[in-house]
C-alpha cells in the first residue's frame, strides 16, 4: 500500500526562493513521519528534512547545506527553500515516510517538480552555503 | 529503559562466519537505524554499515559490503550482523547502536559489545 | 569517504584543568559532527550531537563548537572520571566514519 503525492509540476523561483508543495493522500495527523525533498532525476542529494511526530514540535533541517523551512498540514508538507543557486535549477522530488503506526508506509515516486532559479545570482561562500535550521 | 542486548563472545576459525545479535527494548524499533561499528584491539572505531526495520533497507560501508550481511526480526525487535570469510584481522568488539529515522546523525544508545576472535 | 582527524592522539592533563581536542573534516560536513567518550571496556557514549549540542545527562563542563571541516571539544575543568578516550565522527554522509581517538590520561 503505497501514499501517492501530488506536486506541481513547475515553479519558477524569483529572488531565489520558492515554496514547493507536497500534497499527499494520508492523513498525517497524529503520525511519526519523515517528509523529505530530493534533488535530481536520480534523487540523489536531499535537500530538506521535517521530521514529525504526535509528541514533539516539527523539525526542519538540511544536511547538504540548503536553506530551508517546512510547514506542515494534515495532508501535506510545504518546503520553503531560500537562497538558491541558478544553477540549482534542476527536479525536485517529494518523499513521505510513515514510521508510525506500524506498518510502515512510503510513496509512489511522484513527478516531480521542476524548480527554475531566475533572480539574483548568488555568489556562493566557498564553506557554507546557507544555514541549514536545527 | 532503553537497551541493546548483544549476544555473547564467539571463537571462530578463519574462514568461517559470524552471527551477533542485537536485541532492542524500551523504544519503537521502527523509528531507529540499527548500526554496527567494530573496534578491533587498539584501533579505529568503524562503521560497518545499518538497517532500518521499517523497510529492511541497507546501507553498507564499501569495505564490508561482500562479507557483512544485516537482518532483522521485527517480531522479537532483533538485528542481526552476520560477518562471512573471517580473517584474523576481524578481531575485534563489535558494537550495535541506534540512529534515529527521521533525525539520524548520532548514536544515542549502544549495545554492551560482542568480542569476536578469530584464531586458527 | 570523508576522513576524521583528530588531535592530539593523547595527552595529559591534571584534576582541574581545560581541556581541548580538535577534530578536522576532510571536506565540508556543517554542523554534522559529534562527540564520544569511551572507558575501557566499555561502549563509547555520546556525549555532544551536531557540534555543539550538549546530549541528555552530560555534564556542562563539556562543551563543543565549530562548522564546516573543523570542531572542537573542551572540557572546561577535567574532573577523575573525565580521563578516557574522546572519538568524534561525522553524521553527515554514510558511511559515518570517526576520528581515531584522543587518550586524556593523569598526568
Known amino acids: 500500500n503505497k501514499i501517492l503525492v501530488k506536486q506541481s509540476p513547475m515553479l519558477v523561483a524569483y529572488d531565489n526562493a520558492v515554496n514547493l508543495s507536497c500534497k499527499y493522500s494520508y492523513n498525517l495527523f497524529s503520525r511519526e513521519f519523515r517528509a523529505s525533498l530530493h534533488k535530481g532525476l536520480d534523487s540523489a542529494v536531499e535537500v530538506c528534512v521535517v521530521y514529525g511526530n504526535y509528541s514533539q514540535q516539527l523539525q526542519v533541517y538540511s544536511k547538504t547545506g540548503f536553506n530551508c523551512d517546512g510547514k506542515l498540514g494534515n495532508e501535506s508538507v510545504t518546503f520553503y527553500l531560500q537562497n538558491l543557486y541558478v544553477n540549482q535549477t534542476d527536479i525536485y522530488f517529494c518523499k513521505i515516510e510513515v514510521m508510525y503506526p506500524p506498518p510502515y508506509l512510503d510513496n509512489e515516486k511522484s513527478n516531480g517538480t521542476i524548480i527554475h532559479v531566475k533572480g539574483k545570482h548568488l555568489c556562493p561562500s566557498p564553506l557554507f552555503p546557507g544555514p541549514s535550521k536545527p | 529503559q532503553v537497551q541493546l542486548v548483544q549476544s555473547g563472545a564467539e571463537v571462530k576459525k578463519p574462514g568461517a562466519s559470524v552471527k551477533v545479535s542485537c536485541k532492542a527494548s524500551?523504544?519503537?524499533?521502527?523509528?531507529?537505524?540499527i548500526h554496527w561499528v567494530r573496534q578491533a584491539p587498539g584501533q579505529c572505531l568503524e562503521w560497518i554499515g545499518c538497517?532500518?526495520?521499517?523497510?529492511?533497507?541497507?546501507n553498507y560501508n564499501e569495505k564490508f559490503k561482500d562479507r557483512a550481511t544485516l537482518t532483522v526480526d521485527t517480531s522479537i525487535s532483533t538485528a542481526y550482523m552476520e560477518l562471512s570469510r573471517l580473517r584474523s584481522d576481524d578481531t575485534a568488539v563489535y558494537f550495535c547502536t541506534r540512529s534515529h529515522y527521521g533525525l539520524d546523525w548520532n548514536f544515542d544508545v549502544w549495545g554492551q559489545g560482542t568480542t569476536v576472535t578469530v584464531s586458527s | 569517504d570523508i576522513q576524521m582527524t583528530q588531535s592530539p592522539s593523547s595527552l595529559s592533563a591534571s584534576v582541574g584543568d581545560r581541556v581541548t581536542i580538535t577534530c578536522h573534516a576532510s571536506q565540508n560536513i556543517y554542523v554534522w559532527l559529534n562527540w564520544y567518550q569511551q572507558k575501557p571496556g566499555k561502549a563509547p557514549k555520546l556525549l555532544i550531537y551536531k557540534a555543539s549540542n550538549l546530549h541528555t545527562g552530560v555534564p556542562s563542563r563539556f562543551s563543543g563548537s565549530g562548522s564546516g571541516t573543523d570542531f572542537t571539544l573542551t572540557i572546561s575543568s577535567l574532573q577523575p572520571e573525565d580521563f578516557a578516550t574522546y572519538y568524534c565522527?561525522?553524521?553527515?554522509?554514510?558511511?559515518?566514519?570517526f576520528g581515531c581517538g584522543t587518550k586524556v590520561e593523569i598526568k
Open positions: 538497517i532500518y526495520p521499517g523497510n529492511v533497507n541497507t
Open positions: 524500551g523504544y519503537t524499533f521502527t523509528s531507529y537505524y
Open positions: 565522527q561525522q553524521g553527515q554522509t554514510y558511511p559515518y566514519t
